[in-house]
């Protein structure tokens, strides 16, 4: 150990061996549980790269290798053998290795050892005769560990090499620190003037240079905090450490977005055991009090079909907000924690209950001291106006689904929208939400004239009387009579009805659907083939032209090694070539042949296909 | 593992009740140990998304809320309550609901509870006498959804009718897609076949052509998981979704510098909510190569790269042309039976 | 409360065109199409047409196709109905209304058009 | 075009009668059906929509009944005030189309 780990030894901690000896505290690695490859092996490493400094004198090196159904991983801990672990004593505490005894656990292999040199837990010896379970071995697919990455500091060398001696400004050598490691661990540190890190695993930090690292992140989800150590002439996290020569660890925030984020570095030893968040150590930012923080102002629903976000100004600096949402006779509930953003997705909580009445409030915080308050001794905040979704969510644009004709009635179906609201684990559509209480109107006319004529329904389906021989245009409106704001959606995209013409002329338009389906398919897909393309039919070689750009289909279908796409195509060759046989065996003279057409890539190869699918449209 | 869940029950399964009714299998929350933020309420949700069918019809469903110096878990299983679970007898099988019990644990608080009705271990119940500090009680901790279950369970069919289906003129499926959406979010997944997003926030895509899009990164400093929506028509981290049109989110591994980085999509409601790393694609041997590729005649082939789905074009020569109908494409592939890779034949004929 | 105004009565000789105005107050104007109705002296309701003011939509009889033009100005909240080439059988009462999908709620108080030479 | 054919066009009564006036569509309608009171020299008043459903203020005397083309008005118990012009109206297809009226007069 570097000689500065005289980690102050007071009285109460010395402990002494059966020889009056003072004993120090064990070296061991301590990794707590990571995913592990050993399996099948007379002896594994731990890959386990934290050595850590046990607290107590008497604990001891331990290691636990599990195996279930599902996956392998190994601990390794400090322990103090008067106290059982997991349930088990450690009998063997004194030994100097790290030999694996089976124990019994229901559902599961569970093998253990205790051992008390230094570091004895990175190698775990098993008896030979366990080996025998499983004698096709296999590894496994790499876990935590050196193996397989993790935010793992290096081994530690406990050799320090002269390539590894640094001095500091006035020519001492400087040692490597102590710093609390435990990489990223979930933390309930929130709204304190300062936490202590709860991490047990003390790291000699593996170079000289490196200092003490503290990272605090709070989401929607969670709230984690980091500890490492870290070059302070490497960025971090994208940031550079400049707090690395403080002997304190003072958070900063940082911007991330869909987070709060504030990061400290510091060079005393477990310096980023205790992180500071509060205010007047804070030097760097006067202007983060509370007397400069604003109250959000402009609180606005912004909801459609339900999907229900709260908005607000202005856009924070130096501080951050918090979103509360109650019901008025609920509790409230808190939302979007510490956020620079001035919106908060508040659906997941109005879809509990649409009919109920939502209030919600902003809370402005110093961005960096969330527990600073306003005059009144709280957070400054600004409610919301109230919002009942049932009545005033907007209703979203609707889509025409489908319209079919028979003789002189065109049936109009509208799609049922899908929102977020859950009942019985499946999602609601508008009209199982809004029952009779939704209409929708119908807006038709004639392709011909610009005169519409307007229909109503209480279900999704419109029964309208056209006349015979013509094409109608439709658009229809979502509306919700009872209320009186946001009663109408806006109309729907306008879907027209297709004239009919010639026997044939179906079949060309099915290829032209065939062809988008096929567009959409390739579009998911990387295929660069490029392919004979007749970008300028003339019509008396459209035949000629059609048949390479079926030919040419087929490589598509080839490269893609899609069934959805070989399919189409297929389907698509059929249809073509019945109505290209039709017409008779046209012989046509003076056409280019495939292999003399300029070479296109897929896009500029459909759309010509498509153009000259049209002119068969035209002329049938 | 829980049991996949299948619903068709055969008949080794079949238990009969003390009237002699057939005893179906229970339904239960099934996420072993979480790290849980319970504490100090009167009943909380377990904010497991996974609902499991219990192996065996006499299994019940148990519930595990322990609290240490360092953190709180809360687990969630079927047991069979004729065995002892952590060392305890399942007193209260036949309850209803999930009353949680106090266990003595040394160095740790350590509550039980279990129950026999359909997910009953979702919401756990604190005797009152437990929540000293906070009389005032608060419901649970809430998730996404409906009260806090997260995302849907995966057995749940969403029964949606034929009136809801929309068709494009192709007959293909148009309305716009459900998928979990949580952008960027740290992540335990590691080393799994299969992982759930644990991400709690469903949104109905923007557009009818989106898909759900899930991209899992591990760098020497963490984990993430990213749930999105996205067009596959539009690149999505300068890669191509190709397998959007699948039901399921198998992930693909993407060479990206400095971090192990798999994308995938799909397009079925919330598809990217479980996210699959089935083994052929993940690259358990990334030294696999294809040989040199064979000769086409008039052709000629440079190859950028031999490694495992390399795609590669053979070029007529000289005075020669692709004739029509015909690929240059050839693809190195992995022989399932042999491992062994090998390059795909041409269907390409070059002709003057 | 929630009230609809129309203009003053107007007479025209035949030829001539008249403008009809209904201000709307006490509602959310752009939520609620606005519908004219017609009277002739002695006769029944008749239904001219409506207009959206959301999203400037107008849906017309056959019959007045041509004789009426609908149009709102949104910025206040009034609808106007534009009568042209007036012949006597045009003379009439004319009624604006909201109109809440399922009913005409609320009147106006009607407009006396006479047409005479 | 959907027709509405009223009935009867007049009709006598005396206070405290009960008086019932129908409403025939020449084609399906549901129950998108509306009826209106007018006074001489006023604008119509709205008294039932959707076929059964009252508006607001409207006394209770009044009712709506039926759905598809056959709908009819009751009025329980006549009061002196009742006596009027009574229309239907089809709010289901354009050109939403009146009855012709039924006149109620006091006996």
């Known amino acids: 150990i570097p000689p500065h780990v005289q980690k102050s030894v007071n009285n109460d901690m010395i402990v002494t061996d059966n020889n009056g000896a003072v004993k120090f505290p064990q070296l061991c690695k301590f990794c707590d549980v990571r995913f592990s490859t050993c399996d099948n092996q007379k002896s594994c490493m731990s890959n386990c790269s934290i050595t850590s400094i046990c607290e107590k004198p008497q604990e001891v090196c331990v290691a636990v290798w599990r195996k279930n159904d599902e996956n392998i991983t190994l601990e390794t801990v400090c322990h103090d053998p008067k106290l059982p672990y997991h349930d088990f004593i450690l009998e063997d505490a004194a030994s100097p290795k790290c030999i694996m005894k089976e124990k019994k656990k229901p559902g599961e292999t569970f093998f253990m050892c205790s051992c008390s040199s230094d570091e004895c837990n990175d190698n775990i010896i098993f008896s030979e005769e366990y080996n025998t379970s499983n004698p096709d071995g296999g590894g496994g697919s790499g876990g935590g560990g050196s193996g397989g990455g993790g935010s793992i500091p290096p081994h530690v060398q406990k050799s320090v090499n002269n390539d590894m001696i640094v001095t500091d400004n006035n020519g001492a050598v400087k040692f490597p620190q102590l710093c609390k490691f435990c990489d990223v661990r979930f933390s309930t540190c929130d709204n304190q003037k300062s936490c202590m890190s709860n991490c047990s695993i003390t790291s000699i930090c593996e170079k000289p240079q490196e200092v003490c690292v503290a990272v605090w992140r709070k989401n929607d989800e969670n709230i984690t905090l980091e500890t490492v150590c870290h070059d302070p002439k490497l960025p971090y996290h994208d940031f550079i450490l400049e707090d690395a020569a403080s002997p304190k660890c003072i958070m900063k925030e940082k911007k991330k977005p869909g987070e709060t984020f504030f990061m400290c570095s510091c060079s005393s030893d477990e310096c980023n055991d205790n992180i500071i968040f509060s205010e007047e150590y804070n030097t760097s930012n006067p202007d983060s009090g509370t007397t400069n923080t604003v109250a959000a102002y402009n609180l606005t629903w912004k909801s459609t079909n339900f999907k229900t976000i709260l908005e607000w100004e202005p856009k924070p600096v130096n501080q951050v907000y918090t979103v509360q949402i109650s019901t008025k006779s609920g509790d409230w509930k808190s939302k979007c924690f510490y956020t620079t953003d001035t919106e908060c997705d508040l659906t997941d909580e109005i879809v509990k209950d649409v009919k109920q009445t939502y209030l919600a409030r902003v809370f402005s915080y110093p961005a960096g001291n969330v527990e600073s308050t306003g005059s009144a001794g709280e957070p400054l905040y600004e409610n919301s106006p109230e919002f009942t979704p049932y009545l005033e969510t907007n209703l979203g644009q609707p889509t025409i689904q489908s319209f079919e004709q028979v003789g002189t009635k065109v049936n109009v179906t509208v799609e049922d929208e899908r929102t977020l609201v859950r009942r019985n684990n499946t999602f609601l559509s508008l009209r199982d939400v809004f029952g009779k209480d939704l209409i929708y109107t119908l807006y038709y006319w004639k392709s011909s004239s610009s005169g519409k004529k307007t229909a109503k329904t209480n279900t999704n389906e419109f029964l309208i009387d056209v006349d015979k021989g013509e094409n109608y245009c439709f658009s229809v409106q979502a509306v919700i009579p009872s209320r009186t704001v946001n009663r109408k959606s806006t109309d729907s995209p306008v879907e027209c009805m297709g004239q009919e013409k010639g026997e044939f002329r179906e079949n060309w338009v099915n290829v032209i659907s065939d062809l988008k389906k096929i567009e959409d398919l390739i579009q998911s897909m990387h295929i660069d083939a490029t392919l004979y393309t007749e970008s300028d039919v003339h019509p008396s070689c459209k035949v000629t032209a059609m048949k390479c750009f079926l030919l040419e289909l087929q490589v598509i279908s080839l490269e893609s090694g899609d069934a959805s796409i070989h399919d189409t195509v297929e389907n698509l060759i059929i249809l073509a070539n019945n109505s290209l046989s039709s017409n008779g065996n046209v012989t046509e003279s003076g056409c280019k042949e495939c292999e003399e057409l300029e070479e296109k890539n897929i896009k500029e190869f459909l759309q010509s296909f498509v153009h000259i699918v049209q002119m068969f449209i035209n002329t049938s | 593992i829980p049991p996949h869940v299948q619903k068709s029950v055969n008949n080794d399964m079949i238990v009969t009740d003390n009237n002699g009714a057939v005893k179906f299998p229970q339904l239960c929350k099934f996420c072993d140990v979480r790290f849980s933020t319970c504490d100090n309420q009167k009943s909380c949700m377990s904010n497991c998304s996974i609902t499991s069918i219990c192996e065996k019809p006499q299994e019940v469903c148990v519930a595990v809320w322990r609290k240490n110096d360092e953190n709180i878990t809360l687990e969630t299983v079927c047991h069979d309550p004729k065995l002892p679970y952590h060392d305890f007898i399942l007193e209260d099988a036949a309850s209803p609901k999930c009353i949680m019990k106090e266990k003595k644990k040394p160095g740790e608080t350590f509550f039980m509870c279990s129950c026999s009705s359909d997910e009953c271990n979702d919401n756990i119940i604190f005797s009152e006498e437990y929540n000293t500090s906070n009389p005032d009680g608060g419901g649970g901790s809430g998730g996404g959804g409906s009260g806090g279950g997260g995302s849907i369970p995966p057995h749940v069919q969403k029964s949606v009718n034929n009136d809801m289906i929309v068709t494009d003129n192709n007959g293909a499926v148009k309305f716009p897609q459900l998928c979990k959406f949580c952008d960027v979010r740290f992540s335990t997944c590691d080393n799994q076949k299969s992982c759930m997003s644990n991400c709690s926030i469903t949104s109905i895509c923007e557009k009818p052509q989106e898909v759900c899009v899930a991209v899992w990164r591990k760098n020497d400093e963490n984990i993430t998981l990213e749930t999105v929506c996205h067009d596959p028509k539009l690149p999505y981290h300068d890669f191509i979704l190709e397998d959007a049109a699948s039901p399921k989110c198998i992930m693909k591994e993407k060479k990206k510098p400095g971090e192990t980085f798999f994308m995938c999509s799909c397009s079925s409601d919330e598809c990217n909510d479980n996210i699959i790393f089935s083994e052929e694609y993940n690259t358990s041997n990334p030294d696999i190569t294809c040989p040199p590729p064979m000769s086409v005649e008039h052709a000629d082939i440079w190859v950028k790269s031999y490694s495992l789905y390399s795609r590669e074009r053979y070029i007529c020569n000289s005075g020669f042309k692709r004739k029509a109908g015909t690929s240059s494409l050839t693809e190195c592939v992995l022989n399932k039976a042999t491992n062994v890779a090998h390059w795909t034949t041409p269907s390409l004929k070059c002709i003057r | 409360q929630i009230q609809l105004v129309q203009s003053g009565g107007e007479v025209k000789k035949p030829g001539a065109s008249v403008r009809v105005s209904c201000k709307a107050s006490?509602?959310?104007?752009?939520?609620?199409?606005v519908y004219w109705v017609r009277q002739s002296p002695g006769k029944g309701l008749e239904w001219i047409g409506y207009i959206d003011p959301y999203n400037g939509i107008t849906i017309y009889d056959q019959n007045f196709k041509g004789k009426a033009t609908l149009t709102v100005d949104k910025s206040t909240s009034t609808a106007y109905m534009e009568l042209s080439s007036l012949r006597s059988e045009d003379t009439a009462v004319y009624f604006c209304?909201?109109?809440?999908?399922?009913?005409?709620?609320?009147w106006g108080q009607g407009t006396t058009v006479t047409v005479s030479s | 075009d959907i027709q509405m054919t009223q009935s009867p066009a007049s009709l006598s009564a005396s206070v405290g009668d009960r008086v019932t006036i129908t409403c025939l569509a020449s084609q399906t309608i549901d129950t998108w059906l509306a009826w209106y009171l007018q006074k001489p020299g006023k604008s119509p008043q709205l008294l039932i929509y959707a076929a059964t459903n009252l508006a607001d203020g409207v006394p209770s005397r009044f009712s709506g009944s039926g759905s598809g083309t056959d709908f009819s008005f009751t009025i329980s118990s006549l009061q002196p005030e009742d006596f009027a012009t009574y229309y239907c109206q089809q709010v289901y297809s354009s050109p939403f189309t009146f009855g012709q009226g039924t006149k109620l007069e006091i006996k």
């Open positions: 209304a909201r109109d809440v999908t399922t009913a005409l709620d609320f």
């Open positions: 006490g509602y959310s104007f752009t939520d609620y199409n």
